[in-house]
């Protein structure tokens, strides 16, 4: 006789990463009894709440329940109804946030409390909506690329089932690009981490870690743009700002009210002679890479090495996974191969820049143009990041992997604070159960 | 700005398939689901299904399960309405819409200008 | 799925007359959008999330209600304002229409 399938023991969870720029909800599924175990957990569906992100909606919140109905609806669809009442649902909300609540902590909090009271009218077993800081968010996106490629279990193999595994278990280090923020995060090799603020201890399946992270507020590409305009603004004769960061040919008009709307340009900030002014590109990739290296600020370093703005930075280690912005513009750019040298990438980008606005715009007639216009910018930009504010060189350019999925799952924080927050991390090595881990039974 | 523009008209016998097109410019195709719309002559409307462009998985109402299919080509930015085994009660105008909120937080509704299927044999 | 009830299927009134919609869901939905749509034309958008005039609605319209009643309200009827109109939940799948009010000139 045949055998009854035995009814699949599985649990679900759910995060929404309200970014910035935009909000994604991430499903994801385990085995039930195997909760302890590495690598486990996977991604069965992401869903693009479809807008701008959750800062946007300051002055409408009323409406914040219609901008996620559609993938919270999504996620009553994935997951099957009889698990809907134990499924945890996570939102984490990063740098978009952290930049409203810097302007009024109490608009900050309207926005969450509207957030918590949508996402508690669902049938989920609803946890909560915070501001996770940019040292948490550091910190997860490392542990998500590290469980996901394998680095936390300790039984070695002799095959690899991941890209970029390097079979062995020396960890990978987190390179993740927001709208608003930027995150480095990795272990760094026998070095004292000098600034208490950077420093994380793990226990993770019975091994310590040592690690480093940092998250730059404001150095988001998004926010790194507006940065970027207030300050070449302040020195522009008329209210034309030739942008060598925008392709030839390219013509956009931006209200100063717009570009001093952000805590990002505070800095930057004076009365001008103007309230418009017109970006006018001219697509120089070595000019514009000169523009954005003066948001570095590298004269002044209180350790014995720093990144920009006198943060502490170790010396880099061992291979690194560059993720979210650093792989969606790469991407786009086609420039993701690992074959591609560091050299290759520049002199790629400046053909890229140099083309015609009318060329490109030809070339990429389904791209929405706010976001083809900012490609050149953001590949300079991530070039420039990468090498003078983090230190990468031609040569370690081959230890970043760009990276948008591992094992089908999304390269980002979400995973990680959902390990966390439900526990499925464990400090210790937890102990085999007979026939969890055996090829035949 | 945002513009669907629809096929033409198509006269069909019952039993064929067609396939309508709807074809969109002003903003990233991948942002926002694009949704079908039935409404025969005099009646009400009726919504078939969608597609989300950025993951390519569609919803469809039960109703119209089984002789509908929605499809993209993302390389054109165009979605489509298959519909086969046609039967004359399947005669209405189709309808292609979006919506949601911009950059801005603005919400907005769009839909293409209709295409007309008349089945007769 | 939830069905809309629109009610009165019909209205006839003269030019300067306040007119009163309603849509009526078979269960609770968290907003209501309304249409308005005119002959051998798409519908167009005209109220959304219950209560907010889409662009370049006049002010006369208004909408309200929660839960299971909502109601669109012309404060007083122009000529313009003869067409259909459909209200829509968007708050779960399958989306769904009212069957419709006809505004007819009297």
């Known amino acids: 006789t045949q055998n009854k399938a035995l009814p699949e023991n599985v649990k679900y969870g759910i995060v929404l990463d309200a970014g910035s720029s935009h909000t994604s909800l991430y499903i994801y599924k385990w085995p039930a009894e195997k909760e302890n175990d590495t690598g486990v957990v996977h991604q069965v569906e992401e869903c693009r709440v479809k807008g701008p992100g959750i800062s946007k909606f300051v002055q409408k919140v009323n409406e914040i329940g219609i901008y996620l109905t559609d993938c919270m609806e999504r996620a009553r669809e994935v997951i099957p109804r009889s698990q809907h009442q134990e499924t945890p649902v996570y939102l984490g909300a990063t740098a978009g946030m952290r930049l409203l609540r810097m302007e009024s902590e109490e608009l900050a909090d309207r926005v969450l409390d509207v957030v918590e009271r949508s996402l508690s009218n669902y049938p989920f077993d609803f946890q909560g909506a915070r501001i996770i800081t940019g040292q948490e968010e550091g910190a997860y996106g490392w542990i998500t690329i590290n469980y996901l490629l394998g680095k936390f279990s300790q039984k070695t193999r002799w095959f690899s089932i991941v890209p970029y595994e390097t079979n062995n278990q020396e960890t990978f280090g987190a390179l993740d690009l927001g709208g608003a923020s930027t995150q480095v995060t990795f272990v760094p090799q026998n070095q004292t981490i000098e600034s208490p603020d950077n420093a994380l201890q793990f226990r993770l399946y019975g091994k310590d870690y040592n690690v480093y992270t940092h998250s730059f507020l404001c150095y988001g590409k998004d926010q790194a743009l507006w940065q970027k305009l207030a300050k070449d603004i302040q020195v522009a004769s008329n209210e034309i700002l030739r942008d060598p960061c925008f392709h030839p040919g390219y013509k956009k008009v931006v209200n100063v009210s717009d570009l001093y709307k952000t805590p990002c340009t505070k800095r930057f900030e004076m009365t001008l002679p103007f309230q418009q002014f017109e970006i006018q590109g001219i697509g120089n990739y070595q000019q514009c890479h000169q523009s954005i290296l003066e948001l570095f600020n590298t004269s002044y370093c209180p350790y014995s090495q720093c990144a920009f703005n006198g943060i502490f930075l170790p010396p880099l280690q061992g291979d690194f996974g560059a993720f979210s912005a650093f792989y969606f513009v790469m991407k786009f750019l086609n420039l993701t191969s690992e074959k591609v040298s560091q050299e290759k990438v520049t002199e790629m980008m400046k053909k890229f820049c140099a083309q015609p606005w009318e060329e490109i715009k030809t070339s990429y007639a389904g791209v929405k143009e706010k976001y083809l216009s900012e490609y050149c910018f953001s590949g300079t930009y991530i070039l420039s990041l990468l090498l003078q504010g983090y230190h990468f060189t031609a040569d370690s350019w081959e230890h970043i992997h760009f990276i948008g999925k591992i094992q089908g799952s999304d390269a980002g924080w979400t995973l990680g604070y959902m390990l966390n927050l439900t526990n499925m991390i464990p400090a210790e090595q937890p102990l085999s159960t007979p026939l969890s881990h055996s090829t035949y039974v | 700005e945002v513009q669907l523009v629809q096929s033409g008209p198509e006269v069909k016998k019952p039993g064929a398939t067609v396939k309508i097109s709807c074809k969109v410019s002003g903003y990233s195709f991948t942002d926002y689901n694009l949704n079908w719309v039935k409404q025969p002559p005099g009646k009400n409307l009726e919504w078939i299904g969608n597609?989300?462009?950025?993951?390519?998985?569609?919803r469809y109402n039960q109703k119209f399960k089984g002789r509908f299919t929605i499809t993209i080509d993302q390389s054109i930015n165009t979605a489509y309405m298959h519909l086969r085994s046609l039967r004359s009660e399947d005669t209405a105008v189709y309808y292609c819409?979006?919506?949601?909120?911009?950059?801005?937080?603005?919400?907005?509704?769009?839909w293409g200008q209709g295409t007309m299927l008349t089945v007769s044999s | 799925e939830i069905v809309l009830t629109q009610s009165p299927a019909t209205l006839s009134p003269s030019p300067g007359e306040r007119v009163t919609i309603n849509c009526s869901a078979s269960s609770s939905v968290s907003y209501m959008h309304w249409f308005q749509q005119k002959p051998g034309t798409p519908p167009r958008l005209w109220i959304y999330?219950?209560?907010n005039l889409a662009s370049g609605i006049p002010a006369r319209f208004s909408g309200s209600g929660s839960g299971t009643e909502y109601t669109l309200t012309i404060s007083s009827m122009e000529s313009e304002d003869f067409a259909v109109y459909y209200c829509q939940q968007r708050s779960s799948y399958p989306l769904t229409f009212g069957p419709g009010t006809k505004v007819e000139i009297k």
């Open positions: 597609i989300d462009p950025y993951s390519g998985g569609t």
């Open positions: 999330a219950t209560s």
């Open positions: 819409g979006l919506y949601g909120y911009d950059d801005d937080a603005n919400y907005f509704d769009d």
